[in-house]
Interface confidence: low
């Protein structure tokens, strides 16, 4: 028979729990053996004090009885031949030599019937407290402070952990977080990052990625100071932060045992999310302007926002939805996070400026408004935070209320009358088509353009193919030639102030078709851009190249 207990001496800390195992081998008799635990105190090394027994409930010596009844001291059977002695809260007077004795069930006395191990009780000298997060500074106040950090900014917390145990021990320190307003139980404390007793740094499951990316850091500064830095704070980082220090000692058998643990609340941290702060307003109110006049709109980005820079960046843009059109509208212009401006599709050729005029005020200026610029304008601001490295992550966006912009129409009314000079044309001759344009309204300096179009019959009917441009004269007086069905020469010209002519030379049968004239009125703005102020379409003109009697 052999009774085995751990190799001693064991060092444990007052106020903590201890477990001492005992098992018996090589015995005869029933599989379920009984065990008795005794303590020999240093001041009375020959007196065995009965602690607890697996078979006798009255076994406990007076000093242990109340603790056994309260369940603070107990023997727990692991299996028939193994038990563990558990003491919930060690006291200084629990130091001494512990003997595990197994009453004999053997036919003859053989081997050892007890094992002894010394337990030494160390005073509780582990200290944990909040420390100012900077390298130096005054001690943090006793009540945990309430800290507010902006999303994307750095959260730094410090912890002081020290022990003056007279034995060689190692400290492991970890930073944990519990959800705001949630109860703090064992299950709710989530480890953020910890430094093991061998100085290896480990992060809790949700934080491992951020540790690997360098966004989460933990370092030891000096002998007893630990500093955690969470870069790029996120909404989910809000909560109550704790520092837990655990003291470890190496037992004689080579295994490591935790002998003390203390926790301190460091701070209640609120993360001011950008989405809860970002607000966008526009001015100066509903606008009514005339065509060609400048349109100026202001956008103000407000809220308790971090300044643009290392941790945060902003982009601001203007969107326009044409009057009566559904949907979010199209981009007019924007300034990116670097302050570089760009114009949206369809606005590239326009004189449009987007600029920052104050720390959080942005101006959109269209040098010459057009009726097509009428609609509702919104300012869109986006806030970004810098995560790991220099990568920006969009954290929030906000749109202003719609700002209505009205641009007066020019009130230009065009009418066009077209005809074929001479009424009848023959193959080989020149066909002259004339278009007279009448204009009512419009500003001074109105310019006219006119284009000629043809629809060709197929099998005696007009085809479903859209009309083709034959030629025209632009508002700048420049002629533009399209495609003539017969392939011969074409000329287009302005033959009077409101009169345009199309000539088809050397008519062929392919030139047969229905032609029309399409005039348009244009206005030039101060920024030299043009916009169309009106358009019309003449009635149809049929061109049928007859054959001369001699052609047969």
């Amino acid at each position: 028979r052999e009774v085995l207990v751990p190799e001693g001496p064991l060092y444990r800390v007052a106020g903590t729990a201890v477990s001492i195992s005992c098992n018996v081998t090589g015995y005869e008799g029933p599989a379920q053996q009984n065990f008795e635990w005794f303590l020999y105190r240093p001041e009375a090394p020959d007196t065995a004090l009965g602690i607890v027994s697996t078979k006798d409930t009255q076994f406990s010596y007076a000093v242990f009885k109340s603790r056994v009844v309260a369940g603070e001291v107990q023997v727990q059977r692991l299996q028939g031949d193994a038990v563990v002695l558990k003491i919930a809260r060690l006291q200084a007077q629990d130091a001494g030599i512990y003997e595990c004795h197994t009453p004999s069930t053997d036919t003859r006395y053989l081997g050892s019937y007890s094992g002894k191990v010394e337990l030494r009780v160390l005073p509780d000298v582990l200290q944990v407290s909040a420390a100012p997060p900077g390298p130096r500074g005054r001690q943090a106040p006793t009540s945990p402070p309430r800290m507010t950090v902006h999303e994307g900014q750095e959260l730094a917390l410090g912890c002081l952990a020290r022990t003056s145990t007279q034995k060689h021990t190692h400290l492991a320190v970890s930073f944990g977080r519990s959800v705001p307003e949630a109860p703090v139980g064992r299950s709710t404390l989530q480890e953020v990052v910890g430094i093991r007793s061998d100085l290896a740094v480990e992060a809790g499951a949700p934080y491992a990625e951020r540790l690997a990316a360098g966004e989460l850091r933990l370092g030891k500064e000096g002998t007893d100071r630990y500093r955690m830095v969470v870069g790029g704070a996120q909404a989910g980082d809000a909560g109550t932060y704790h520092c837990t220090a655990a003291e470890w000692i190496q037992d004689p058998d080579g295994s490591w045992a935790q002998i003390a643990e203390k926790r301190a609340v460091l701070a209640h941290v609120d993360v001011q999310t950008l989405s809860s702060q970002l607000a966008v307003t526009v001015g100066p109110g509903e606008r009514r302007i005339g065509p060609g006049e400048p349109l100026e709109l202001l956008c103000n980005v407000s809220g308790a926002l971090p300044p643009a820079g290392r941790h945060a960046a902003y982009s601001v843009g203007w969107e326009m939805a044409p009057a009566g059109a559904p949907g979010p509208g199209r981009l007019v212009a924007q300034l990116d996070t670097e302050g570089v401006g760009s114009l949206g599709p369809g606005y590239e050729g326009r004189h449009i400026a987007m600029e920052k005029v104050a720390s959080r005020t942005y101006r959109l200026r269209l040098e010459a408004a057009r009726p097509g610029d009428a609609g509702t304008y919104r300012c869109l601001a986006k806030a970004y935070v810098r995560g790991s490295g220099t990568r920006l992550r969009e954290a929030a966006s906000a749109r202003s209320r719609p700002l209505p912009v009205h641009v007066r129409e020019e009130g230009v009314v065009l009418e066009a009358v077209a005809w074929l000079a001479g009424g009848t044309v023959y193959r080989g001759e020149t066909a002259s088509l004339l278009c007279n344009i009448s204009v009512r309204g419009g500003p001074p300096g109105l310019r006219l353009a006119a284009s000629w179009w043809v629809e060709r019959p197929e099998d005696g009917e007009l085809s479903s193919v859209p009309a083709q441009l034959v030629g025209g004269v632009g508002q700048d007086g420049v002629a533009e030639l399209g495609v003539r069905p017969g392939g011969g020469p074409v000329s287009v010209e302005l033959v009077g102030p409101r009169s345009h002519r199309l000539r088809l030379h050397s008519l062929g049968p392919e030139d047969e078709g229905v032609y029309h004239c399409a005039p348009s009125a244009w206005v030039q703005h101060a920024d030299y851009s043009w916009y169309q102020a009106g358009s019309a379409r003449s009635g149809p003109v049929t061109v049928y190249p007859y054959m001369h009697a001699l052609d047969t």
């Epitope: 109860p183 139980g185 949700p206």
Partner: antibody
């Protein structure tokens, strides 16, 4: 089988107090967070209070904060809700609920409910 | 606040989906439960907890899922006895809105 039996309901007077008790059986209560949920007549479920496995942390809904105390006796397998300064809007059926964790404060983790005890607050 | 539709209806044998959104994030994850109540004042029955866990005594036609912070309760092959009010439960850091307002399922 897991069973939760609530008691202590009945007719109460406004301004008075009541004590509801939930007796658990079929599982070891000491490993789980317990919650109280109530339902006013014709209304939906409303979370009232929660207490974690070892009773070290409690949380309350804003509607009862300052008037309610949740406690537990793991040895007796009971959870108690004390509600003072009763109001008419406290009327309803009170359910005791067991969660699957020790301390999560989450109404998405309830795996067992009691049958409820009816409370009527009226003068 | 947890948001769910006030009512849904289906013919027997059809598949019904009820959604719930607006729960708070618990360490970056979202956990919802689904509870059935056949009549007001009767005890709720847990159909699904932790997004997709189904108690052993609940029929397999009830299933749960969660994606992008929205939970979905799916009843495949709905039966007449499934007519009830379905509540979703979740996490809310303010403890104000831990349950949705309930969805009434009508089996036509």
């Amino acid at each position: 089988a897991v069973t939760l039996d609530e008691s202590g309901g009945g007719l109460q007077t406004p301004g008075g107090g009541l004590s509801l008790v939930c007796k658990a059986s079929g599982f070891s209560i000491s490993s789980y967070e317990m919650q109280w949920v109530r339902q006013a007549p014709g209304k939906g479920l409303e979370w009232v209070a929660g207490i974690d496995d070892d009773g070290s942390s409690r949380a309350y809904a804003p509607a009862v904060k300052g008037r309610a105390t949740i406690s537990r006796d793991n040895g007796q397998s009971t959870v108690r809700l004390q509600l003072n300064n009763l109001r008419a809007e406290d009327t309803g059926t009170y359910y005791c609920a067991k969660t699957i964790y020790a301390a999560t404060l989450n109404a998405g983790e309830i795996d067992a409910w009691g049958h409820g005890t009816e409370v009527i607050v009226s003068s | 606040a947890l948001t769910q539709p006030s009512s849904v209806s289906a013919n027997p044998g059809e598949t019904v989906k009820i959604t719930c959104s607006g729960g708070g994030s618990w360490y970056g994850s979202y956990y919802y439960g689904w509870y059935q109540q056949k009549s007001p004042g009767s005890a709720p029955v847990t159909l699904i907890y932790n997004n997709d866990k189904r108690p052993s005594d609940i029929p397999s036609r009830f299933s749960g899922s969660e994606s992008g912070s929205t939970a979905t309760l799916t009843i495949t092959g709905v039966q007449a006895e499934d007519e009830a009010v379905y509540f979703c439960g979740g996490y809310d850091s303010t403890t104000t809105d831990m349950f949705g307002a309930g969805t009434t399922l009508t089996v036509l």
